[in-house]
Amino acid sequence: CTCVPPHPQTAFCNSDLVIRAKFVGTPEVNQTTLYQRYEIKMTKMYKGFQALGDAADIRFVYTPAMESVCGYFHRSHNRSEEFLIAGKLQDGLLHITTCSFVAPWNSLSLAQRRGFTKTYTVGCEECTVFPCLSIPCKLQSGTHCLWTDQLLQGSEKGFQSRHLACLPREPGLCTWQSLRSQIA
C-alpha cells in the first residue's frame, strides 16, 4: 500500500475529524470485518464538532488489520505521547489508514500546530494545495497553490509543509502564506 503523504492542510481539509489523542491500548481485531481498533484518549478536537454532534468523545480509532490493505500500525509504545490524528467518519466511527495524517504532536512545527488549531480551516473552502511532482507543473486555477516540497527536497517535511498554508488572498485567488504571520 503506497500513498504520497499529503500537505497537512490537505489532510485537515479532507478529513471529517481532526483530533489530538494518546494511544492507550493494544489493538483488538474484529474477526467479522478484520478491522482493528486502537483505544485512544482524546485530548483536543480541532475539526468534527458538527459531524459528531453530541457524541463528541472518541474512544477508538479503526483501521484495516492488515498492512496489505492500507492498515495503520501504531509503533510507539509511549502511552503518554500525543498524536495528531486526521481521519474519516464512517457510521460515527473514526477510521484511518496508512495514508492518513497521523503524527506525534511534538514532531509538528509551531506553524503546523497553529495551522491545525485555527488557520488551515480558513483555506478549506476556496483553496487547494496542488502537488507538483514533476517539472513542468503549472497552476490549474488561481485558487491553487503549487506544493513543491517533494520536488525540491524529496520530502513532504519541507518548508511549505512545515511553515505555510494556502489561504485566500482575495476572491478567486489563493497564495502561500506564512503561518508565523497569522495571529497566534
Epitope: 493494544t26 489493538p27 481485531v29 474477526q31 467479522t32 470485518t33 478484520l34 484495516p64 488489520a65 492488515m66 498492512e67 496489505s68 490493505v69 492498515g71 500500525f73 509503533r75
Partner: antibody, heavy 113, light 110 residues
Framework: QVQLVESGGGLVQPGGSLRLSCAAS????????MSWVRQAPGKGLEWVSA????????YYADSVKGRFTISRDNSKNTLYLQMNSLRAEDTAVYYC??????WGQGTLVTVSS | DIALTQPASVSGSPGQSITISCTGT?????????VSWYQQHPGKAPKLMIY???NRPSGVSNRFSGSKSGNTASLTISGLQAEDEADYYC??????????FGGGTKLTVL
C-alpha cells in the same frame, strides 16, 4: 463445543484442482474470520489463506496467491478452499482454523504424478 | 518462512517445570495479544493449549500457562508428565501476513 471438520482431500496430479470444505459447528460461524493452515510431511505449520467473518476480505500467502481461492457460505456454516494449478510442494495436511484459536483434524492433499 | 523463533528442543524430568520461548517482532507477538500455543503428538492434529497469550481452553490442564513480555511469548509446563512429550508450536496474529508460526519445539520428557 467448537467443531471443525475438513473434507475434500485426496491424490491429485500436478496442475490439477481440488476443493476443500470445512463444516463448522458449536459457534456463530459468521462472527469469525476463518483460515486454512497446512503442514507438509515432517515440516512445520504454514498459514495459507484467511477470510473475514462477513466474507468481504480475503488474504493469501504469497506461495498460493493466484492459485488458491478461499470462500465461505455463512448460511451453511461452511468454509471452502479452491486449489488450482497444484504443485508437488502443495502436498500437506490442510487444517481449517477458526480465528486465532481452534483447528480441525485436517485433510491430506497429495500432489503427485 | 519461519517468522517466530522457538528453541528446536527442550527437555525436562517428570515433575519439573519447563518454559518454551517464542520471539517475534512488534508487528506480531509484541503488537497484539493474540498468541496461541499448540501441542502436536506424532501423526495427530495440533491441539490448542493456550490462546490470547494466557487463556486456557476448557479441558486443558492448569499445568499449562502462557505469558508475554515485549516481543517474546512463553509457554510454561509445570509438573511435567510423560504425556506432555510432543511438538509445541506458537502462533501469533501478524499485521503483515495474518498468521505466523514458530518453527516448533520438540519437548522430551526424560
Amino acid at each position: 463445543q467448537v467443531q471443525l471438520v475438513e473434507s475434500g482431500g485426496g491424490l491429485v496430479q500436478p496442475g490439477g484442482s481440488l476443493r476443500l470444505s470445512c463444516a463448522a459447528s458449536g459457534f456463530t460461524f459468521s462472527s469469525y474470520a476463518m483460515s486454512w493452515v497446512r503442514q507438509a510431511p515432517g515440516k512445520g505449520l504454514e498459514w495459507v489463506s484467511a477470510i473475514s467473518g462477513s466474507g468481504g476480505s480475503t488474504y493469501y500467502a504469497d506461495s498460493v496467491k493466484g492459485r488458491f481461492t478461499i470462500s465461505r457460505d455463512n448460511s451453511k456454516n461452511t468454509l471452502y478452499l479452491q486449489m488450482n494449478s497444484l504443485r508437488a510442494e502443495d502436498t500437506a495436511v490442510y487444517y481449517c482454523a477458526r480465528g486465532f484459536d481452534y483447528w480441525g483434524q485436517g485433510t491430506l492433499v497429495t500432489v503427485s504424478s | 518462512d519461519i517468522a517466530l523463533t522457538q528453541p528446536a528442543s527442550v527437555s525436562g524430568s517428570p515433575g519439573q517445570s519447563i518454559t518454551i520461548s517464542c520471539t517475534g517482532t512488534s508487528s506480531d507477538v509484541g503488537g497484539y495479544n493474540y498468541v496461541s500455543w499448540y501441542q502436536q503428538h506424532p501423526g495427530k492434529a495440533p491441539k490448542l493449549m493456550i490462546y490470547d497469550v494466557s487463556n486456557r481452553p476448557s479441558g486443558v490442564s492448569n499445568r499449562f500457562s502462557g505469558s508475554k513480555s515485549g516481543n517474546t511469548a512463553s509457554l510454561t509446563i509445570s509438573g511435567l508428565q510423560a504425556e506432555d512429550e510432543a511438538d509445541y508450536y506458537c502462533q501469533s496474529y501478524d499485521f503483515k501476513t495474518y498468521l505466523v508460526f514458530g518453527g516448533g519445539t520438540k519437548l522430551t520428557v526424560l
